[in-house]
């Protein structure tokens, strides 16, 4: 039969799945079927287990005791559970690994001991668990790696020691875990690593050292030849050395943000053929562009806030698959030709020292959609610099030294920013930009060429009916945007506004001519000048 209040169902193999979770039980049910294969006793009030409390459950494969009040598990608690593969003891109040109770669970593959109060792991506690594949020890009170206890777990494939108080990883801490694929050590207090602390982890693919107190780059990773995913973000690492990942050619992902990294060795990221994304912000001591030889599949490269003054002419030869390049906030003056980077979709070079865009700089970048060159010192742009960029829709040249602006090839632009180019005083014809939605110009009179004056009045009058908004609200010069008084109407407003803009072929241009600066006067002033 099925124990009172429990839910029982066949498991499809002539055996029984029994769910007695969250029933307020203080002891184990007594009338369990010998043919039970799954027993869930989690989220109850069980505070102790007697020796041999589950007699004759020789077919039991999964036992869940999570979320109870167990402080101790006696020897013999799991006697006779010859088929047990999964044992869940998380969210209890255990203070040490129940060594005696775990003996002879030869079939056990998964053991959850997370979210207890375990501060001690006896040296021989896992010695009989020859089949163990997954071990959870996270969210406990461990202060050191239980090195000896792990020596018997040669079949272990995944382990988490996260959310403990571990401060050091000694040499060969995991020396016998040759099958381990995943190791989580995040959210500890690790400040030092033995030079050989990861030696022996020949199958490791994922290593998580995030949220620790590491002061130095973890060079011990160099023996992890199968490592695919590495995290050491949110530490206190200040530099990444030369050849940092030389032993990890399989790396696909590296997370190292939220470290005060100032310096990166030029060869640090070489020979990582699987790496797709590399992001490094604020490494102010980098003066040279990294040598990315052998890291040819990089799709996104962000290297901002450094002191890079030049790029190698062959930069694109190394990075033929690059789609996103962000080198903003550097000291770049000259630019190489990016034309070999055929897959580039986005380039961000704002806040550099660039003074000229040559004819070949961005030639034949057929996929380029966004180009940001704002806050440079660009005075010269070759007339055909943008002539072979058929996909370009966003171009930002604001805050440069332009006195003229070449329009060739820019007919597909939807966003154009030229604000802050004080020497750029000529009018730009709207006919060159049939797709334009947003344009920012140095001067308000330049918006008149885009029909902003009349259209702005038409739309404002239309939307002013029954509305007490002031004209100032409707003509925000700095934003060039209309304000909506009632937030609930925002979505409707934007939809209708978009339709109106389409209907009127209007462009959002700033700084917008206001009612006190009508286009006639502005244009008169420009003509006189």
């Amino acid at each position: 039969g099925c124990p009172t209040h429990c839910h029982c169902e066949p498991d499809g193999r002539m055996l029984l799945r029994v769910d007695c979770s969250d029933l307020g039980l203080s002891e184990l049910p007594s009338n369990l079927s010998v043919f039970t294969s799954y027993l869930d006793l989690s989220m109850n009030n069980i505070s102790q287990l007697l020796p041999n409390p589950l007699p004759s459950l020789r077919f039991l494969e999964e036992l869940r005791l999570a979320g109870n009040a167990l402080t101790y598990i006696p020897k013999g608690a799991f006697t006779g559970l010859y088929s047990l593969k999964v044992l869940m003891l998380q969210n209890n109040q255990l203070r040490q690994v129940p060594t005696e109770a775990l003996q002879n669970l030869r079939s056990l593959q998964s053991l959850r001991l997370d979210a207890n109060h375990i501060s001690y792991v006896p040296p021989s506690c896992f010695s009989g668990l020859h089949s163990l594949r997954h071990l959870w020890l996270d969210d406990n009170a461990l202060t050191e790696i239980p090195v000896q206890a792990f020596r018997s777990l040669s079949a272990l494939q995944a382990m988490t020691l996260a959310l403990n108080k571990i401060h050091h990883i000694p040499d060969y801490a995991f020396g016998n875990l040759s099958s381990l694929v995943v190791l989580h050590l995040h959210n500890n207090r690790i400040h030092s690593l033995g030079k050989k602390c990861f030696d022996g982890l020949h199958s490791l693919e994922t290593l998580d050292l995030n949220y620790n107190n590491l002061d130095e780059f973890p060079t011990a990773i160099r023996t992890l030849s199968n490592l695919k995913e590495l995290g050491f973000h949110s530490n206190n690492i200040r530099s990444i050395p030369e050849k940092a990942f030389v032993g990890n050619p399989s790396l696909i992902t590296i997370h190292f943000y939220d470290n005060p990294i100032q310096f990166v060795g030029r060869s640090a990221f070489q020979h990582l053929p699987e790496l797709r994304t590399l992001t490094l912000n604020g490494a102010s001591q980098i003066t040279e562009f990294p040598d990315l030889t052998g890291t040819a599949n990089l799709e996104s490269l962000t290297l901002t806030g450094a002191q890079i003054s030049s790029l190698p002419q062959t930069v694109c030869n190394q990075l033929p698959n690059l789609q996103v390049l962000d080198l903003s906030y550097n000291l770049l003056e000259d630019l190489p030709s990016f034309s070999v980077c055929q897959k580039l979709q986005k380039i961000d070079l704002r806040h550099n020292e660039i003074y000229e865009i040559k004819v070949d700089t961005f030639q034949q970048l057929l996929s380029l959609r966004s180009l940001n060159l704002a806050w440079n010192k660009i005075a010269i742009i070759h007339p055909n610099a943008f002539s072979t960029l058929p996909s370009l829709i966003k171009l930002d040249l604001s805050s440069n030294l332009l006195s003229s602006f070449p329009v060739t090839g820019l007919h597909g632009l939807t966003h154009l920013k030229l604000t802050g180019n004080h020497a750029l005083q000529s009018l730009i014809s709207s006919e060159n930009f049939p797709e334009l939605k947003i344009i920012e110009m140095p001067y308000a009179y330049q918006c008149c060429a885009f029909g902003v004056c009349e259209n702005a009045y038409k739309i404002s009058n239309q939307w002013n009916k029954g509305d007490n908004s002031s004209m100032d609200d409707l003509h925000k010069k700095d934003a060039g945007m209309f304000q909506v008084q009632d937030e609930r109407d925002l979505e409707d407003f934007l939809l209708d506004f978009e339709e109106d803009l389409k209907a009127l072929h209007s462009v959002q241009c700033s700084p917008s001519p206001g009612p006190f600066k009508p286009c006639e006067h502005l244009l008169d002033g420009w003509l006189i000048r």
């Epitope: 000896q148 050989k196 030696d199 022996g200 020949h202 160099r222 023996t223 030849s225 030389v246």
Partner: antibody, heavy 118, light 111 residues
Framework: EVQLVQSGAEVKKPGASVKVSCKAS????????IEWVRQAPGQGLEWIGE????????DYNEKFKVRATFTSDTSTSTVYLELSSLRSEDTAVYYC???????????WGQGTLVTVSS | DIVMTQSPDSLAVSLGERATINCRAS??????????MHWYQQKPGQPPKLLIY???NLESGVPDRFSGSGSGTDFTLTISSLQAEDVAVYYC?????????FGQGTKVEIK
Amino acid sequence: EVQLVQSGAEVKKPGASVKVSCKASGYTFSAYWIEWVRQAPGQGLEWIGEILPGSDSTDYNEKFKVRATFTSDTSTSTVYLELSSLRSEDTAVYYCARGGHYGSLDYWGQGTLVTVSS
Amino acid sequence: DIVMTQSPDSLAVSLGERATINCRASESVDNYGNSFMHWYQQKPGQPPKLLIYLASNLESGVPDRFSGSGSGTDFTLTISSLQAEDVAVYYCQQNYEDPFTFGQGTKVEIK
């Protein structure tokens, strides 16, 4: 099958340098340390130092720090020991060995006899 | 440096009898419960061969008549039943700290 094959015997004059090679095969070259050990005729074993191939990670016995240099070439899976300023007491068989389980030396090269004689 | 002292320097044992070699370290070579002590066998004209790692773990392929024990500073290699092919020099080695050091060797012969 793991193998370490060393270069042939060398005869050198005092003050000269010698470069011994150790070619590894049968395992992931960059995942294991290579140790260098020497044995003078009829004597015991003396550890010179270690290198993790492909990286700049090296450790030298203080006694050899000034004169010994370890290098590696990942393209050929070869590690090198160069010993300079040779003297007669450097006459020995020089072994490379792989640092295996817990740093024990689980595979050894056949040894290279270096004779220093004027 | 950690000094490794083996005793005896040489040992003659009858075939089938037990041979015991001791090794003492000048300081403990234990770390986090592991004893960083290894044993090697070297036959004439050959490189050393690993027998035992971490004081008591038998290396793969090594006959089980070889065993190791001890911790801290005192360690023992035992050959439970000496065979003719066991004639060799045996070395202990520590890799607890640099420089890694070897014992002076113990020569095992047949009585």
